[in-house]
């Protein structure tokens, strides 16, 4: 997250970190069910661990943390690497979470976002770009949903209805390491960090997010079919 600020503790209990060995964050994810996460399809890896209820990026033990293995990864059938359309994936955890103030699912919004909606994006991704500097703790950033026209104008021929753009003033954006993390609007999960300009936080180049309102049926049916 570029030019965000430290999230208040316990305010993002659905935020998950996907880790490669040794405790190496590579993507964010979101708890949407006691045993299921949503993340970006481009975050697919064969072997990874899931950390929930953790505030700092470092692997230091925190009393609220819960660790899991991902036992099943189900990318959306419409996703094709390395594209960005249909960029979402469900991950089944090896067991159900223990609900606490630090670990709690969030509902996926069935309403598509309208321009001007205020949202919050979070993650442990780099706070600088193009060089890399990871934060000590979870970062939060207020962003506004842009109209689909502004989104298409920013990225000609790259945007479809499985994506939406959101941003703020130049210099504020999601970035490397935030992929798959949540965009929360009006208390519901509206999007996942998907892609954006290179380097991040360029003027008139907003972040692009998976438009989850288009996938509520697939999410529900996939969880039911695999539970």
């Amino acid at each position: 997250i570029i030019n965000g600020s430290d999230c208040d503790m316990h305010t993002q209990p659905w935020q998950a970190a996907l880790l490669l060995r040794p405790n190496q964050l590579y993507c964010g994810a979101v708890l949407v069910h006691p045993q299921w996460l949503l993340t970006a399809a481009h975050c697919r890896k064969k072997v990874f661990r899931v950390r929930l209820g953790h505030y700092s990026l470092s692997p230091v033990y925190e009393s609220g943390q819960q660790m899991f293995q991902g036992v099943k990864s189900i990318p959306h059938p419409g996703y094709s690497h390395p594209g960005h359309s249909n960029d979402l994936m469900l991950i089944k955890l090896n067991r159900r979470i223990r609900p606490t103030k630090d670990v709690r699912p969030i509902n996926v919004s069935s309403h598509c976002p309208s321009a001007g909606t205020k949202c919050l994006v979070s993650g442990w991704g780099t706070t600088k770009s193009p060089q890399v500097h990871f934060p000590k703790v979870l970062q939060c950033l207020n962003i506004s949903v842009l109209s689909q026209k502004r989104c298409e104008d920013a990225y000609p021929r790259q945007i479809d209805d499985t994506m939406f753009c959101a941003g703020d003033k130049a210099g504020r954006d999601s970035c490397q390491g935030d992929s798959g993390g949540p965009v929360v609007c009006n208390g519901s999960l509206q999007g996942l960090v998907s892609w954006g300009d290179y380097p991040c936080a360029r003027p008139n180049r907003p972040g692009v997010y998976t438009n989850l309102c288009k996938f509520t049926k697939w999410i529900q049916e996939t969880i039911q079919a695999n539970s």
Partner: antibody
Framework: QLQLQESGPGLVKPSETLSLTCTVS??????????WAWIRQPPGKGLEWIGN???????YYNPSLKSRVTISVDTSKNQFSLKLSSVTAADTAVYYC????????????????WGQGTTVTVSS | EIVLTQSPGTLSLSPGERATLSCRAS???????LAWYQQKPGQAPRLLIY???SRATGIPDRFSGSGSGTDFTLTISRLEPEDFAVYYC????????FGGGTKVEIK
């Protein structure tokens, strides 16, 4: 199958500007999933990264070359270009163009497709 | 800038032997941002490993990468005749840089 091909003059005079083009075939530059890079290798030496460009035109340059480098993209021709001004004999090298995958995960995917390289000699 | 120092400069081995190549960074680098390349004379570099330990598409499993912080290693478990080449590490954690290379030659 994606292929990259460098082209440009093989001989440049000192103090002039080196200009090279990389033509992309079998794939499209206007893709949000990749960036495009220039790397060089002086004779008998190692590799030096020059800079990257994204399809949108956003660039990232090697700080030691930044004052002399311009990388641009022409999506209509599926090409990207390198200009290096005020060249000296130290700029004599094989120049490569390459492609790298890009997303917002915290993973560097490396540069997976390279051109075969073009030799540029700086001499009067 | 982050300086990558590769050692040894030259490694003389026979086919079938194990090769261990070292790459040391002047400051800590996230392992996610380290790659290895192979280069043969007159050819462009070829991506072998990204993210310190993930094999690129089509790379045989005799190539493996490991390490974190400032110390990274490329291992070739059993050298094949086509593996004799120069190997470069590269970081993209800050402004991208390459190591000076290790030449693996036939003993």
């Amino acid at each position: 199958q994606l292929q990259l091909q460098e082209s440009g003059p093989g001989l440049v005079k000192p103090s002039e500007t080196l200009s090279l083009t990389c033509t992309v075939s079998g794939g499209s530059i206007p893709s949000s999933s990749y960036y495009w890079a220039w790397i060089r290798q002086p004779p008998g030496k190692g590799l030096e990264w020059i800079g990257n460009i994204y399809y949108s035109g956003s660039t990232y340059y090697n700080p030691s070359l930044k004052s002399r480098v311009t990388i641009s993209v022409d999506t209509s021709k599926n090409q990207f270009s390198l200009k290096l001004s005020s060249v000296t004999a130290a700029d004599t090298a094989v120049y490569y163009c390459a492609r790298g995958e890009y997303d917002r995960s915290a993973l560097y995917y490396g540069m997976d497709v390279w051109g075969q390289g073009t030799t540029v000699t700086v001499s009067s | 800038e982050i300086v990558l120092t590769q050692s040894p400069g030259t490694l003389s081995l026979s086919p079938g032997e194990r090769a261990t190549l070292s790459c040391r960074a002047s400051q800590s680098v996230s392992s996610s941002y380290l790659a290895w390349y192979q280069q043969k004379p007159g050819q462009a570099p070829r991506l072998l490993i990204y993210g310190a330990s993930s094999r690129a598409t089509g790379i045989p499993d005799r190539f493996s990468g490991s390490g974190s912080g400032t110390d990274f290693t490329l291992t070739i478990s059993r050298l094949e005749p086509e593996d004799f080449a120069v190997y470069y590490c590269q970081q993209a954690f800050s402004s991208p840089t390459f190591g000076g290379g290790t030449k693996v030659e036939i003993k």
